[in-house]
C-alpha cells in the first residue's frame, strides 16, 4: 500500500513539476527590467527564451520574437536546449510511469517489469528536473553577470549633461517557476525510485521452500505472503515460483501474487 502511495505521489509531483517546466519555458518573464534605484520609466521591459516584450504605461504590450538562431548568445541557446531536453525527458518519463503505476493493470504485466519501468521513469524525472534547474541557474548566472556589468557603466557620459541610462535586468517570475518545477520533478523522480525498490521482488520471494508432511504440505512464503495449504501424495520438496507457483508435477497450485493486487 505504501509503495502504491509513494509511486502515485511521485507521479503526481513529477506531473506538476513537468507542467511547471513547460510553463517556465514558455513564459516571457525570464528577466525583467530592474526598477530599483532606476529612473521611473513609462516603459517596462521583460524578456523570455523566445521573445522580448515591452509593456507601456498605456497598457500596450509589444513582443518581438528572436527570429535569428545564429545571432543569439550561446548561453541562451544552452538554456533553451536544457529546458527542451528537460521537457522531452519528463514527457517520456510521464508516459512510462503511467504504465508503471501499480494501480493500473495492463494485461499480465509482471511486477518486475513495473519495477523496471518505475525506476526508468524515476531516473528520467531526476534528469529532467536537473536539466530544468541547470537551465534556470545558467540563465540566472548570466543575469547576475550582466547586472553588475551594466551597473558598473550604468551612466555613460555623453558630453555635458546628456546621459544614457542602460536598462538593467533582474530575475523574472519564470526563474522561480523553473526552480520550483525542477525541484518538484526531481523529488517526484526520487519518490519513483524509492517506490521501485518496494515493487521489485527480492530474491527470497522467488525461492520459498515448501515442506510437505505425509499427505499434507504447507508452503511458507516470506515477506508477508499468505501461506497456502495443499493436499497430495507427493512428499518431495518443491520450489514455488513467482506468478503461478505451479509445482513440478502440476499436483498443487498456489495463489498468484496478482490475486492480492
Amino acid at each position: 500500500m505504501a509503495v502504491t502511495a509513494c509511486q502515485g505521489l511521485g507521479f503526481v509531483v513529477s506531473l506538476i513539476g513537468i507542467a511547471g517546466i513547460i510553463a517556465a519555458t514558455c513564459m516571457d518573464q525570464w528577466s525583467t527590467q530592474d526598477l530599483y534605484n532606476n529612473p521611473v520609466t513609462a516603459v517596462f521591459n521583460y524578456q523570455g527564451l523566445w521573445r522580448s516584450c515591452v509593456r507601456e504605461s498605456s497598457g500596450f504590450t509589444e513582443c518581438r520574437g528572436y527570429f535569428t538562431l545564429l545571432g543569439l548568445p550561446a548561453m541562451l541557446q544552452a538554456v533553451r536546449a536544457l529546458m527542451i531536453v528537460g521537457i522531452v525527458l519528463g514527457a517520456i518519463g510521464l508516459l512510462v510511469s503511467i504504465f508503471a503505476l501499480k494501480c493500473i493493470r495492463i494485461g499480465s504485466m509482471e511486477d518486475s517489469a513495473k519495477a523496471n519501468m518505475t525506476l526508468t521513469s524515476g531516473i528520467m524525472f531526476i534528469v529532467s528536473g536537473l536539466c530544468a534547474i541547470a537551465g534556470v541557474s545558467v540563465f540566472a548566472n548570466m543575469l547576475v553577470t550582466n547586472f553588475w556589468m551594466s551597473t558598473a557603466n550604468m551612466y555613460t557620459g555623453m558630453g555635458g549633461m546628456v546621459q544614457t541610462v542602460q536598462t538593467r535586468y533582474t530575475f523574472g517570475a519564470a526563474l522561480f517557476v523553473g526552480w520550483v518545477a525542477g525541484g518538484l520533478t526531481l523529488i517526484g523522480g526520487v519518490m519513483m525510485c524509492i517506490a521501485c525498490r518496494g515493487l521489485a521482488p527480492e530474491e527470497t520471494n522467488y525461492k520459498a521452500v515448501s515442506y510437505h508432511a505425509s499427505g499434507h504440505s504447507v508452503a511458507y512464503k516470506p515477506g508477508g505472503f499468505k501461506a497456502s495449504t495443499g493436499f497430495g501424495s507427493n512428499t518431495k520438496n518443491k520450489k514455488i515460483y513467482d506468478g503461478g507457483a505451479r509445482t513440478e508435477d502440476e499436483v498443487q497450485s498456489y495463489p498468484s501474487k496478482h490475486d492480492y493486487v
Partner: antibody
Framework: QIQLVQSGSELKKPGASVKVSCKAS????????INWVRQAPGQGLEWMGW????????TYAEGFTGRFVLSWDTSVSTAYLQISSLKAEDTAVYFC???????????WGQGTLVTVSS | DIVMTQSPDSLAVSLGERATINCKSS????????????LTWYQQKPGQPPKLLIY???TRESGVPDRFSGSGSGTDFTLTISSLQAEDVAVYYC?????????FGGGTKVEIK
C-alpha cells in the same frame, strides 16, 4: 468617435477648492489612462500626473503632490482633478488627455480655465 | 527630471519653405527592449488643446499631413515641416514619453515670414 469633455471655467478665491471633471466617451474608459496637463497663461505645457482607471494606479509629477488629487468614477466614465487650498499661481488651463499606445496623448479635452483671484 | 530643450524658441519661415525644430533630451529616450524612441511631437494653436502629430520620434499620427516628419534617436530629435502652410502657424512641443514625469519641451513658435 473618441471624446473627452471637460467641465466649464471656474473662478475661485485663494484657499478654496475646485474639482475639474473630464468625461470620456467613444471607448472603454477603464482600458486607457487619463493624464492631466497644466498650461499657465502664455506658458508651455506642464505634465501633472496620470491615473490608470483599470489598476487604480496614480502617478504625480513632483510639483503636484499634496494639494492635487486625481480620481475617477468608472460608472460615469469620468476622471477628476481636485485642487485644494488654491493659490494665485494655480490660475491656468487644465487639460485632460487619453494615454494611448506609444505613450502618446492621442485625444485631449477642450481644457478648463481655473482662475484664482481675490 | 528629464529636461527637454527645444530650439529655436520661435521660427519665421516663408510659405512653402522648410521649417525645422530641434529637441534635445537630458537622457536617452531610446528603449533597448523594442528599439523605439519615446519622443512625441504636438501642435497647439491659440485657444485650442494640443494635437498629436508624431509619436515614437518618427511615426506620424493618422490624419496628420505627410509634410510633417520626425527624425532622430537617443537624445537629439527633429520635427520637419517640409513645406510650410498657413494653417501650420502654431506652437510645437516635444515630449518625453519614456521617463516620469512625462516632461514637455518649452515650445517653438512657428510664424510666417
Amino acid at each position: 468617435q473618441i471624446q473627452l469633455v471637460q467641465s466649464g471655467s471656474e473662478l475661485k478665491k485663494p484657499g478654496a477648492s475646485v474639482k475639474v471633471s473630464c468625461k470620456a466617451s467613444g471607448y472603454t474608459f477603464t482600458n486607457y489612462g487619463i493624464n492631466w496637463v497644466r498650461q499657465a497663461p502664455g506658458q508651455g505645457l506642464e505634465w501633472m500626473g496620470w491615473i490608470n482607471p483599470n489598476t487604480g494606479e496614480t502617478t504625480y509629477a513632483e510639483g503636484f503632490t499634496g494639494r492635487f488629487v486625481l480620481s475617477w468614477d468608472t460608472s460615469v466614465s469620468t476622471a477628476y482633478l481636485q485642487i485644494s487650498s488654491l493659490k494665485a499661481e494655480d490660475t491656468a488651463v487644465y487639460f485632460c488627455a487619453r494615454l494611448y499606445y506609444g505613450n502618446r496623448f492621442d485625444s485631449w479635452g477642450q481644457g478648463t480655465l481655473v482662475t484664482v483671484s481675490s | 527630471d528629464i529636461v527637454m530643450t527645444q530650439s529655436p524658441d520661435s521660427l519665421a519661415v516663408s510659405l512653402g519653405e522648410r521649417a525645422t525644430i530641434n529637441c534635445k533630451s537630458s537622457q536617452s529616450l531610446l528603449n533597448s527592449g523594442n528599439q523605439r524612441n519615446y519622443l512625441t511631437w504636438y501642435q497647439q494653436k491659440p485657444g485650442q488643446p494640443p494635437k498629436l502629430l508624431i509619436y515614437w520620434a518618427s511615426t506620424r499620427e493618422s490624419g496628420v499631413p505627410d509634410r510633417f516628419s520626425g527624425s532622430g534617436s537617443g537624445t537629439d530629435f527633429t520635427l520637419t515641416i517640409s513645406s510650410l502652410q498657413a494653417e501650420d502657424v502654431a506652437v510645437y512641443y516635444c515630449q518625453n514619453a519614456y521617463y516620469y514625469p512625462l516632461t514637455f519641451g518649452g515650445g517653438t513658435k512657428v510664424e510666417i515670414k
